[in-house]
């Protein structure tokens, strides 16, 4: 199943020759260009960058590129009124108070319209009271608070680090704690490399910077007011109370310099172990409150930032299939960012701009793909996926019909050590096949496949001598494709030695200092890296597009079905009275996984087999393969999450960022000991298990000889 | 089945011991926190003491009126939890239910009574 | 401490009849409450717990309300078996505490 074949042109139009028209050079000049200003979404700035991509890739070939506009939830600072956070004494005096902006980097002094740092969608307010530091915020640190320590946070200010989970979980879990207030800060320990200098000298993150984010839990819903469909021209829109996700307590974050002022006071409990504990010089008592000498001292927030309905723009070009247009690869990645966006999404977005410009050469000459390609410059990732999410609901007919596979393209780099990939398992085997034809840009791998220093760098956990390849969670605009839709999907970039660097993400990630210069002069300065992504994510696109036969592995489904089976069981079987009180039992999805396995296997072996010279053959076996991550839809969606509807993946319901197998049961047993009635609480485990076998085995039967 | 089963009270002396037990079933004791409270006709229902599971490394929680005076503990192996009173006072004369985390099933109790 | 205060302390139903008892905590306790039922000589059963979710095996008769400080029990049709005693407690933090208790008697 090769797809060296071309259509209509000369053989010379294959793989080959799209990889060998993708230059490094390029891909450093279009992130140069889109990282000289602010691209903050819903702004003039941004509508003027979508109007240049869509001109660019006119030119570069495709057959159309449309403007596509949304008018959805925004958050924004008050300019007149900024948010800062102070500590207040007995008299109500603020005798500190947190900065208002990031010292701006060299050469970006006199740069208009940079945001100061803010957490999007955060409702106003003045909350006063004692602090109590929570850790990272996840739910096994407030379980540690309450649990075991004994400590309240209702009514009370909590100041977590950043970091290990989605921002916007850590203000839930706040929330659900009973806070009023949420302060948020990078510590060193997680974004300040050891050995490595600060901004502009290094990589790092100085005291004075601070990571935006917004702080939603959508859970795959979209624009905030419009849950389920487009926020189109005629949309009905909620009210503000009834929007989807907001956070209900105000929230701020701040860097290192002003988290130690507010950490060095901390009184109360000690830290109950080593793992609350950061690098900057202060005990991290969790408190509540100030120690003895300061213990009349308050926090007080002031949050003044607004929701605004705004109109964004995706971009949407499309390159025609000559044999099948009705069927869509889709590569896609975000245009807007919280400043300059020199990583996040530029790093993406100049990638995705030189396989546009490698393809539509290749049109120029005469060559089509089989299938017609979709590239998307989405707006509004960083406000929670709004653009790509409110494109597909105004799509999703044609989605679900017509879509073979969406590959994401956020920041290409998060790092420069190895490859990192997270895909459904239907692409593993193309991932494989493509990584070992490219060669790698490793240091000491020169003259050495992708597929050998990735698999060294990064091996599989299970199976040896072949490498690491992760379940898809969320946080990017995959998530409307594979949660909601059931479109297999995939996303690569070159990432960090995870072994060695344990700080989470990189430590100028969403600051002001995240420009062109971070990337050229410390991440990768020859754009190799930048280049061998290009490489990944367009060859994908490119396989996908163009192979006769689509280059999907049903058998790969079976194994990790039978892994995450195996774990979901295991995690089960920490209550085995209760399994017998209840008669829980999992053997209807091990035998749906082995009716799988046994179903894959003879679908494969067709595969080899039939004549693909007939095209109705083919495009039956193929639509079997499209259809099959859609079979793992479920239409009512998960419990309390209709949006995330794959029964196999779905985000963690404790951090967005990571996936979750078998979510359903995962979830129902989740914490079941401390569920107040286990009659119920059993009884939703059974009811997941249940639907979990059932979409297996229906899934099975989607790949069963049709007649 | 949810089952709790109080055992060895009595009568005791001012001033005296006793170690109450209770042995748990239908449920798999060692992840679960327990419980024991107290009941008067004069105070009515009154929370005594907790202890978590291993997983909460075995944290235990007392109210005042025992503090220093009792000790829960558990034997997860005999799926048992267990409650050793000392000094005991005329005013913890009570029936002693075992109960499951947030009261959700309690045993049929044990009665001690503190009398000269 | 946390100080639940129940009323009335007793109070006479017919069969048929609805009934309503409410439980008072000294401060916020969320939903953090139970409702439990005692017959004479046995232990308390569960009947309500988060204030408002009804345990299982529990008669769609009692329904529970309330979050903050004021909560209530209800019993939209009092039946024969039902007279006897009903306490609400919070587990919202440490004492873990309990009202004085409702006797409710039949008419």
């Known amino acids: 199943k090769s797809s060296n074949e071309a259509t209509n042109i000369t053989p010379k139009h294959n793989m080959k020759a799209f990889l060998d028209e993708l230059k490094a050079e390029n891909i450093k000049k279009f992130l140069y260009n889109f990282t000289q200003i602010p691209h903050l979404a819903g702004t003039e700035q941004n509508f003027q960058l979508a109007k240049q991509i869509q001109s660019q890739w006119k030119e570069f070939g495709l057959d159309s590129v449309e403007l596509a506009h949304y008018d959805v939830l925004l958050s924004y600072p008050n300019k007149t009124h900024p948010n800062y956070i102070s500590i207040i004494n007995e008299d109500g005096n603020e005798i500190f108070n947190t900065s208002l902006f990031e010292p701006p980097p060299p050469g970006y002094e006199n740069v208009s319209d940079i945001v100061p740092p803010f957490s999007a969608f955060s409702p106003q307010g003045m909350p006063e009271g004692d602090l109590v530091y929570v850790n990272y915020a996840r739910t096994e640190d407030f379980f540690k608070l309450e649990r075991d320590m004994k400590i309240n946070c209702s009514g009370k200010i909590v100041i977590a680090r950043y970091g290990k989970v989605f921002r916007g979980n850590k203000v839930k879990n706040a929330q659900l704690a009973g806070a009023k207030g949420v302060i948020l800060y990078s510590d060193p320990a997680d974004y300040f490399a050891p050995g490595v200098k600060s901004y502009p000298d290094g990589w790092n993150l100085p005291g004075g910077g601070v990571q935006r984010g917004n702080i939603l839990n959508l859970n795959g819903a979209g624009d905030p007011l419009t849950p389920g469909y487009p926020a189109n021209e005629y949309a009905y829109r909620r009210g503000i109370a009834e929007a989807v996700g907001l956070p209900s307590i105000p929230v701020h974050p701040i860097g290192y310099y002003d988290a130690q002022k507010l950490l060095e006071k901390m009184g109360g409990s000690a830290p109950p172990d080593s793992s609350w504990r950061g690098s900057l010089k202060v005990p991290y008592n969790v408190g509540p409150g100030f120690t003895g000498n300061f213990s009349t001292q308050k926090v007080k927030m002031h949050i003044h930032s607004t929701n605004e309905v705004t109109r964004i723009y995706n971009v949407i070009g499309t390159l025609r299939g000559a044999v099948e247009p009705d069927r869509y690869v889709i590569l896609g990645g975000h245009r807007d960012s919280w400043v300059f966006g020199g990583i996040d999404p530029q790093s993406g977005a100049a990638v995705v701009h030189e396989i546009v410009r490698s393809f539509g050469t290749l049109k120029k000459e005469g060559w089509r793909p089989r299938r017609t390609i979709l590239f998307a410059s989405w707006d509004a990732e960083e406000f929670g996926l709004l653009g790509s999410t409110e494109w597909a609901e105004e799509n999703s007919r044609l989605l679900q019909e017509r879509g073979v596979a969406y590959i994401n393209a956020d920041s290409s780099i998060e790092g420069n050590y190895t490859l990192r990939v997270d895909c459904t398992p239907l692409m593993y085997s193309l991932v494989h096949n493509l990584t070992k034809e490219l060669k790698s840009p490793d240091e000491g791998f020169e003259g050495k496949s992708l597929y050998e220093s990735w698999t060294k760098k990064s091996p599989s956990p299970e199976f040896s001598g072949m490498p690491r390849i992760s379940k898809l969670g969320s946080g990017n605009d995959f998530e409307v494709f594979f949660q909601r839709l059931g479109i297999a999907s995939g996303r690569a970039r070159y990432t960090k030695n995870w072994e060695t660097n344990k700080f989470s993400g990189y430590p100028l990630y969403h600051s002001v200092y995240e420009t062109y210069e971070l990337v050229e002069k410390f991440y990768d300065p020859m754009f190799k890296y930048h280049l061998t992504v290009a490489q990944v994510r367009g060859g994908m696109v490119f396989e996908l597009a163009n192979s006769i036969v689509l280059p999907f592995d049903c058998r790969d489904y079976a194994v990790v079905l039978r892994k995450y089976a195996d774990k979901i069981y295991s995690i089960s079987m920490k209550h085995p009275q209760e399994m017998k009180t209840y008669s829980v039992s999992f053997d209807s999805l091990f035998s749906a996984v082995k009716n799988f396995t046994e179903i894959a296997s003879k679908f494969s072996e067709r595969l080899q087999d039939f004549d693909k010279s007939n095209p109705i053959v083919l495009r039956m076996m193929n639509d079997q393969l499209m259809f099959l991550e859609r079979a793992f839809i479920d239409p009512l969606g998960l419990p309390d999450r209709p949006f995330y509807r794959h029964v196999i993946y779905a985000p963690s319901s404790h951090n967005k960022y990571a996936g979750e197998s078998f979510p359903g049961i995962y979830d129902a047993l989740f914490d079941i000991e401390s569920k107040v009635d286990p009659s119920k609480a059993w009884g939703e485990v059974k009811r997941q298990i249940y639907v979990a076998a059932f979409t297996v085995q229906a899934a099975a039967e989607t790949l069963s000889e049709v007649a | 089945e949810v089952k709790l089963e109080e055992s060895g009270g009595g009568l005791v002396q001012p001033g005296g011991s006793m170690k109450i037990s209770c042995v748990a079933s239908?449920?798999?004791?060692?992840?679960?926190?327990m419980n024991w409270v107290r009941q008067t006709p004069e105070k009515g229902l009154e929370w005594v003491a907790e202890i978590r599971s291993q997983s909460n490394n075995f944290a235990t929680h007392y109210a005042e009126s025992v503090k220093g005076r009792v000790i829960i503990s558990r034997d997860d192996s005999k799926s048992s939890v267990y409650l050793q009173m000392n000094s005991l006072r005329a005013e913890d004369t009570a029936v002693y239910y075992c109960t499951r985390r947030w009261n959700n099933f309690w045993g049929q109790g044990t009665t001690v009574t503190v009398s000269s | 401490n946390i100080v639940m205060t129940q009323s009335p302390k007793s109070m006479s139903a017919s069969a048929g009849e609805r009934m309503t008892l409410t439980c008072k905590a000294s401060e916020n306790v969320g939903t953090y409450v139970s409702w439990y039922q005692q017959k004479p000589t046995q232990s308390p059963k569960m009947l309500i717990y988060g204030a408002s979710n009804r345990f299982t095996g529990v008669p769609d008769r009692f329904s529970g309300s309330g979050s903050g400080t004021d909560f209530i029990l209800t019993a939209s049709s009092v039946q024969a078996e039902d007279p006897v005693d009903y306490y609400c407690g919070q587990s919202y933090t440490f004492p873990y505490t309990f009202g004085g208790g409702t006797k409710l008697e039949m008419k």
């Open positions: 239908g449920f798999t004791f060692s992840n679960y926190w």
